[in-house]
Interface confidence: low
């Protein structure tokens, strides 16, 4: 079934919604609003200034932090550009990808993609879990995904960016730091930017348990970033989810596993990478529809339109997108151990249900969704699942 | 050490509700994702519901969707399962599962049992 | 929802020998961005909670013995254990962690021959 566009009100409040790091079914609607999660299995993010609450949360705040506006592909103003997606090669965007500026213009419900434009992207398997944003906020990652942000010292009363699963995108103040050290790979239905379930606020400096490289973008589930616990979440894209090697033994034993399990990406990962995961040989390209999230503060313009490589996987990608000053991270990055990570290698799940997530510079990270199986997927991050045509 | 103890759990008839708790100890509880696992007798392990380690995000499975609802307190290192419209098919051991940025479930509580029957 | 086949339903080895179980996923659950299967494997020991044993498809859990591998990609995945010990009678269940909902293979009963 050819992609829809999402033209309805309550498809642009999707898209606001978000899903956090764990994706639910996209028939589940977060009890709680939350920004979308980040990672799908297993990583969730805060928006800006906002708490982490897991890896759906975290892919919120990523997304908070690239923009409130979202773009897709097919809207005019980014002609020719090239996104990378999720996978690391490098996307040619349709030339119908509008701008930041324009988008926000428009009404928040961005356009369905041609299909034609889905073949830019890599294909993505299935959604097998379903997510459905709350009301309230976006989430991270179904299921994509539960990925654990929060630090050693959470900050429960910070902002929750929903993972894996479902859960709104409320707007929040962007920063030029966000710091991720673990996602919550779940996503969640309460709150939609529960995106790793990040304990701290963006920029604060908590310790952050090291897990075993096992923040999946659920995705699956986002629980860490809204279940998230699937993901994202993710529910968790970090190298390790944990700074400190000393606050317990259980985070000890996690951050022996995140060191064993190497980069950035493994462990913050959404626990549940909704949708992330690739698709096999032979899998046919599902058709898709492009979301993207602008930074907020580039939302004005679109300079130069020109995408911002992401590092292939297993290649550091700090300072891709560090500034010169090393306090600032470009559009569709986050502050993560110190340097800048794109939001895609953090949260595999930052797009939900196989949507790919791919990078355009000043405008952020944006998802390319998937129609397929008679199931059509829609939202900012993918996260909204229609079967209804 | 790392420990979840779960509790509330008992007979209830069909139509009830049940609140079941899980006391978490070892770790930094509002770091982590939490889950609810069931496995009714004989059977086979059903994700049920997570959590983001900030309490922000839920996820439901849809067998139980509109009817359960995840909550933790982090002040209590307590996540709760909160069971309404309870069913036969409901009946389970639940357990509590800490979960891990990748969405595994690294640590496991010693479950409790939940008999809905008439 | 992503369906997690395990077979065979049960199996029986002798003391020693080398045990294999088989996971499948109707989707793939390798996310291409950190090329990551999310695929876990439990043991259940009966009146026991289950026991992570291997995470992203082939990353032993802390503490678990050597003799349990995994290995697969996409939708394919198997669980190995080396050289069955009596303690390792138990039941195995693969899940996929990578979207929600997460899901379990039916399970798979390892026995002593």
């Known amino acids: 079934v050819p992609a829809r566009e999402a033209g309805s009100a309550v498809e642009a409040e999707e898209l606001v919604k978000g899903s956090p790091a764990w994706e639910p079914p996209a028939n589940d609607t977060r009890e709680e609003a939350g920004p979308p999660a980040a990672g799908e299995d297993e990583a969730s993010w805060t928006a800006p200034g906002g708490e982490l609450a897991g890896p759906e949360e975290v892919l919120q705040e990523s997304a908070a932090v690239t923009g409130t506006a979202w773009l897709e592909a097919d809207s005019p103003g980014l002609g020719g550009v090239t996104a990378e997606a999720g996978s690391g090669d490098a996307q040619a965007l349709p030339a119908t990808l509008q701008a930041p500026h324009e988008v926000l213009g428009q009404s928040i419900m961005p356009p369905a993609i041609p299909e034609a434009t889905e073949a830019s992207g890599p294909p993505s398997p299935t959604p097998g879990d379903k997510l459905s944003p709350a009301s309230e906020l976006p989430k991270e990652s179904p299921l994509e995904v539960w990925l654990n942000l929060g630090g050693s010292t959470p900050d429960p009363q910070g902002p929750e960016l929903t993972y894996p699963f479902q859960g709104t995108l409320e707007p929040q103040p962007a920063s030029d730091i966000i710091d991720i050290d673990y996602f919550e790979g779940l996503d969640g239905e309460g709150r939609g930017a529960d995106l790793g379930s990040f304990p701290g606020s963006p920029g604060t400096s908590e310790n952050h348990p090291d897990t075993e490289g096992e923040t999946p973008s659920w995705s699956l589930l986002d629980l860490y970033d809204d279940f998230t616990p699937f993901d994202e979440s993710d529910f968790y894209p970090t190298t390790s989810f944990y700074d400190d090697l000393d606050e317990e033994e259980e985070e000890e034993e996690d951050d022996k596993d995140a060191v064993g399990g190497g980069d950035l990406e493994d462990e913050n990962e959404l626990l549940v990478p909704t949708g992330k995961p690739g698709l096999g040989p032979g899998t046919g390209q599902p058709t898709s529809r492009w979301h993207a999230v602008p930074p907020q503060h580039t939302l004005g313009s679109v300079p130069g339109s020109s995408i911002a490589l992401r590092p292939r996987p297993g290649e550091p990608g700090r300072d891709l997108a560090s500034s010169e000053n090393g306090t600032e991270c470009r559009s569709g990055f986050v502050r993560h151990n110190g340097s800048c990570r794109s939001v895609c290698d953090l949260f595999p799940s930052y797009c939900h249900n196989g949507g790919q997530c791919y990078l355009v510079e000043n405008i952020g990270a944006f998802c390319r969704c998937n129609t397929q199986d008679y199931i059509w997927h829609k939202g900012m991050r993918c996260e909204s699942i229609i079967t209804d045509f | 050490e790392v420990q979840l103890l779960e509790s509330g759990g008992g007979l209830v008839q069909p139509g009830g509700s049940l609140r079941l708790s899980c006391a978490a100890s070892?770790?930094?509880?509002?770091?982590?994702?939490m889950s609810w696992v069931r496995q009714a007798p004989g059977k086979g392990l059903e994700w049920v519901s997570a959590?983001?380690?900030?309490?922000?995000?839920?996820y439901y499975a849809d067998s139980v969707k509109g009817r359960f609802t995840i909550s933790r307190d982090n002040s209590k290192n307590t996540l709760y399962l909160q069971m309404n419209s309870l069913r036969a098919e409901d009946t389970a051991v639940y357990y509590c599962?800490?979960?891990?940025?990748?969405?595994?479930?690294?640590?496991w509580g010693q479950g409790t049992l939940v008999t809905v029957s008439s | 929802d992503i369906v997690m086949t395990q077979s065979p339903d049960s199996l029986a080895v002798s003391l020693g020998e080398r045990a294999t179980i088989n996971c499948k996923s109707s989707?793939?659950?390798?996310?291409?961005?950190?090329?990551?299967?999310?695929l876990a494997w439990y043991q259940q020991k009966p009146g026991q909670p289950p026991k992570l044993l291997i995470y992203?498809?082939?990353t032993r859990e802390s503490g678990v013995p050597d003799r349990f591998s995994g290995s697969g990609s996409g939708t394919d995945f198997t669980l190995t254990i080396s050289s069955l010990q009596a303690e390792d009678v138990a039941v195995y269940y693969c899940?996929?962690?990578?979207?929600?909902?997460?899901?379990f293979g039916q399970g798979t009963k390892v026995e002593i021959k």
């Open positions: 599962a800490k979960t891990k940025p990748n969405n595994a479930f690294d640590y």
């Open positions: 070892g770790f930094t509880f509002s770091s982590y994702a």
């Open positions: 959590i983001s380690g900030s309490g922000g995000s839920t």
């Open positions: 989707q793939s659950v390798l996310y291409s961005s950190n090329n990551k299967n999310y």
């Open positions: 992203w498809a082939s």
């Open positions: 899940q996929q962690t990578a979207t929600q909902p997460l899901t």
